[in-house]
Interface confidence: low
């Protein structure tokens, strides 16, 4: 992914579309890679990542990965293509407007991951149980 201050050179009128043909431009995501975090035992946390990046590819979405082991807690924020696995997991919730954390099985640590497709949506990561049920907000048709 290209940092925000680097201008990309793309021909005018080059357009990228999704499977439906809807116009798609790259979105903005928090992109700090792996940072130590104080986020623990909270319903939601802010990423505290000051870097907002334009994702390199139009199909990329925002991802956050929260990991806790005996030594520390880290939060990873990136752009990633939902067609490809991340940390060996499929991004099942890539169309969600919010980053709703779901626990994944990883030996030796507690591992949560979320993905979402609205600008900087991985800045606010949500652990609250109430969002993990069939929240109507998540049923909105989201397109880019």
């Amino acid at each position: 992914t290209i940092p925000p201050h680097v201008q990309k050179s793309v021909n005018n009128d080059m357009i990228v579309t999704d499977n439906n043909g809807a116009v798609k431009f790259p979105q903005l995501c928090k992109f700090c890679d792996v940072r130590f975090s104080t986020c623990d035992n909270q319903k939601s946390c802010m990423s505290n990542c000051s870097i907002t990046s334009i994702c390199e590819k139009p199909q990329e979405v925002c991802v956050a990965v929260w990991r806790k082991n005996d030594e520390n807690i880290t939060l990873e924020t990136v752009c990633h293509d939902p067609k490809l696995p991340y940390h060996d997991f499929i991004l099942e919730d890539a169309a969600s407007p919010k980053c709703i954390m779901k626990e994944k099985k990883k030996p030796g640590e507690t591992f949560f991951m979320c993905s979402c497709s609205s600008d900087e949506c991985n800045d606010n990561i949500i652990f609250s149980e109430e969002y993990n049920t069939s929240n109507p907000d998540l049923l909105l048709v989201i397109f880019q």
Epitope: V10, F25, L28, D119, V141
Partner: antibody, heavy 121, light 107 residues
Amino acid sequence: QVQLVESGGGLVQPGGSLRLSCAVSGFKFRRYAMSWVRQAPGKGLEWVSSISASGDRTHNTDSVKGRFSISRDNSKNTLYLQMNSLRAEDTAVYFCAKGLAASGKNYFDPWGQGTLVTVSS
Amino acid sequence: DIQMTQSPSSLSASVGDRVTITCRASQSISSYLNWYQQKPGKAPKLLIYAASSLQSGVPSRFSGSGSGTDFTLTISSLQPEDFATYYCQQSYSTPPTFGQGTKVEIK
């Protein structure tokens, strides 16, 4: 509150040029795709052009390709439409609008008040 | 390009009436359908996005339904400020296209 204010419209002869501007306030301009939509007198709405949040990608309707160019200056919170080789059929009110093709929901909202472009000899 | 056809092109109604406007796409557009209201000399205003989601600040008397090719905008009880022209717009494919408009006039 969110405001989009267009300027630069006026009377121009066929073959002439105009540059429209849209000054934006009330939201983080650099984070959103922007578009131009036009409306000929007494007619319906027609999408003209869109530009991505960073300004690196643009898309135009076929009838203006090679003649119109959309651009933006994120440091000035301003959207532009450079219109060259103007034709009588380009006569319309030109609206700038936030959205379309940005992340999130694919619609135009909000809109500016519009600026009238009249192409006539 | 996808053609959007609205009907009727105009209608007369009274305050308190239930008003229905339809929009038909020339091919399936899933739920990629938005509705706008425009008053004379003013900019369009988004009412409904994604076929049925009410935009923030829009009165609940406005509702949208449909998917595929056939869509409906309903005003459950017409108010004086609702007399305007209404447009549908598809965002399923490029270029995004609008219906020709439906003018709602006072009877």
